[in-house]
C-alpha cells in the first residue's frame, strides 16, 4: 500500500532522520531505499539496536545508518544535492509483503544572526518615522520574519517613534523550517541620529 509523502527537513552539514517507524521489526526482511538512484538497503542485524545498512550509491558512503528497532534511516553530513524524493520499499514476512513509505527531503542552512538596517524617513514634532529592514546574510528559501513586541510579520517594519517609546526594544526574528535567530535594536537608538544628521544606521 502506498502512503502519502512525508516531508523531512534537514540542516546542511548535519543529520536527518527518516521516520520509518517499524512496529514489528521481527517481520522485516529488507528495506530498499531509492531516491534519484538506488541509495541503500537495510536488513535485520543480530544486534536488535542496529539493522545492517548496505549503501548502494557512492554519494552516500559512510553517511547512512539505521536505528533499531524502528528501522529509522539517518543520513549525516547533509549536502544540498541530497534534497529530493526518497522511497522506502519495506519487504516483510507477512501479507501484504511490501509496503512503500515516501519522503521529501528539504535541506536548509542554519540561519545566522539577522541584520537590522535603519532608515530615517522623517521627523516631526519629536516623532520620527523610521523604517527597519531585517535580513539574513545569504538569501535563503522559506525564511519568515517577525517583529516583537509588535507582532508584525515581514522583513520591513515602519515605526512612528515618540519620546514615550524610548524604553522599547524592537527584535527581529528570522526563521526557516530548521532554525531561527534574532537581532534587536533599542528605541533610544532610532531617532538619536537625527541631531547628527544621519539617515541610516546599521546594527551589529
Amino acid at each position: 500500500k502506498d502512503s502519502e509523502i512525508f516531508t523531512v527537513n534537514g540542516i546542511l552539514g548535519e543529520s536527518v532522520t527518516f521516520p520509518v517507524n517499524i512496529q514489528e521489526p521481527r517481520q522485516v526482511k529488507i528495506i530498499a531505499w531509492t531516491s534519484k538512484t538506488s541509495v541503500a538497503y537495510v536488513t535485520p542485524g543480530d544486534s536488535e539496536t542496529a539493522p545492517v545498512v548496505t549503501v548502494t550509491h557512492r554519494n552516500y558512503y559512510e553517511r547512512i545508518h539505521a536505528l533499531g528497532p524502528n528501522y529509522n534511516l539517518v543520513i549525516s553530513d547533509l549536502r544540498m544535492e541530497d534534497a529530493g524524493d526518497y522511497k522506502a520499499d519495506i519487504n516483510t514476512q507477512a501479507d501484504p509483503y511490501t509496503t512503500t513509505k515516501r519522503y521529501n527531503l528539504q535541506i536548509y542552512r542554519r540561519l545566522g544572526k539577522p541584520k537590522i538596517t535603519q532608515s530615517l524617513m522623517a521627523s516631526v514634532n519629536s516623532t520620527c518615522n523610521v523604517t527597519l529592514t531585517c535580513s539574513v546574510e545569504k538569501e535563503e528559501k522559506n525564511v519568515t520574519y517577525n517583529w516583537s513586541p509588535l507582532g508584525e510579520e515581514g522583513n520591513v517594519l515602519q515605526i512612528f517613534q515618540t519620546p514615550e517609546d524610548q524604553e522599547l526594544t524592537y527584535t527581529c526574528t528570522a526563521q526557516n523550517p530548521v532554525s531561527n535567530n534574532s537581532d534587536s535594536i533599542s528605541a533610544r537608538q532610532l531617532c538619536a541620529d537625527i541631531a547628527m544628521g544621519f539617515r541610516t544606521h546599521h546594527t551589529g
Epitope: 500500500k1 502512503s3 517507524n21 512496529q23 514489528e24 521489526p25 521481527r26 517481520q27 526482511k29 536488513t43 535485520p44 542485524g45 543480530d46 536488535e48 528497532p69 516483510t92 514476512q93 507477512a94 509496503t99
Partner: antibody
C-alpha cells in the same frame, strides 16, 4: 502502569457481527503494535495477527483473513476486533496484546464471545 | 507454518520439586537476524497469559529466578527449579521468528 481494558462478554447468533474493543492506557498508543490472540474454550492460544497503531495497517494470519477486521480509534487509544458472519467456531476468548518489538509484554483480560442459536 | 509441540501435556509435581517442560519446533526458529524468538508464557486459571521468558533464555522483568529457559534450533526447555503454588497453570511456548507466529499446545502444571 500499562493497561489494556477489553469490552465485556458478548452473546451472538450465527451470522451476526461482533465488535470488541481494547482500550490502552499508560503508554503512547501509536508507538507499539497491537496483536489479537484467540483461545477457544479449553484450548490453546492462536495468533490472529496485528495492527500497526501508527498507520492502521492490519496484518492477518491466513486463518483469519476474510471475516475478521482489526481497526483503531487512535484518539481514544482503542483497538477493535470485528468478526462478521459469526459461526460456532468463533466461540472463544479474544485477547488484545501489546507488543514491545521483540515480545508480547502486556495482555488484556480477554473478551468472551459466545455464538449460539 | 511452524508447528510447536509441547511435552508433556500435563505435568503433576510436588511443591518444591523441579519441573521441566519441553517445546520442539517443526523447523529451525532462528530468525534471519540470527536471534531466536522463542518465548514462554504462563496462563493461570481464569487469567490472561503473562510473559516469563523471551529470546529463549531471558527472564522478563519481575519473573523469579527459579524460572530458566534454554535450547537452540528446534529444541527448547523451560525449567522451574522449585515449584511454588503460584506457578500452577498452563505454560505455552511461542515462536515469533516466522510468520504466522505460533504457540505450542500448552502444558498444564498441577499439584501431584
Amino acid at each position: 502502569q500499562i493497561q489494556l481494558v477489553q469490552s465485556g462478554p458478548e452473546l451472538k447468533k450465527p451470522g451476526e457481527t461482533v465488535k470488541i474493543s481494547c482500550k490502552a492506557s499508560g503508554y503512547t498508543f501509536t508507538t507499539y503494535s497491537m496483536h489479537w490472540v484467540k483461545q477457544a474454550p479449553g484450548k490453546g492460544l492462536k495468533w490472529m495477527g496485528w495492527i500497526d497503531t501508527a498507520t492502521g495497517e492490519p496484518t492477518y494470519a491466513d486463518d483469519f483473513k476474510g471475516r475478521f477486521a482489526f481497526s483503531l480509534e487512535t484518539s481514544a487509544s482503542t483497538a477493535y476486533l470485528q468478526i462478521n458472519n459469526l459461526n460456532n467456531d468463533d466461540t472463544a476468548t479474544y485477547f488484545c496484546v501489546k507488543s514491545a518489538y521483540w515480545y508480547f509484554d502486556v495482555w488484556g483480560a480477554g473478551t468472551t464471545v459466545t455464538v449460539s442459536s | 507454518d511452524v508447528l510447536m509441540t509441547q511435552t508433556p501435556l500435563s505435568l503433576p509435581v510436588s511443591l518444591g520439586d523441579q519441573a521441566s517442560i519441553s517445546c520442539r519446533s517443526s523447523q529451525s526458529i532462528v530468525h534471519i537476524n540470527g536471534n531466536t524468538y522463542l518465548e514462554w508464557y504462563l496462563q493461570k486459571p481464569g487469567q490472561s497469559p503473562k510473559l516469563l521468558i523471551y529470546k529463549v533464555s531471558n527472564r522478563f522483568s519481575g519473573v523469579p529466578d527459579r524460572f530458566s529457559g534454554s535450547g537452540s534450533g528446534t529444541d527448547f526447555t523451560l525449567k522451574i527449579s522449585r515449584v511454588e503454588a503460584e506457578d500452577l497453570g498452563v505454560y505455552y511456548c511461542f515462536q515469533g521468528s516466522h510468520v504466522p507466529w505460533t504457540f505450542g499446545g500448552g502444558t498444564k502444571l498441577e499439584i501431584k
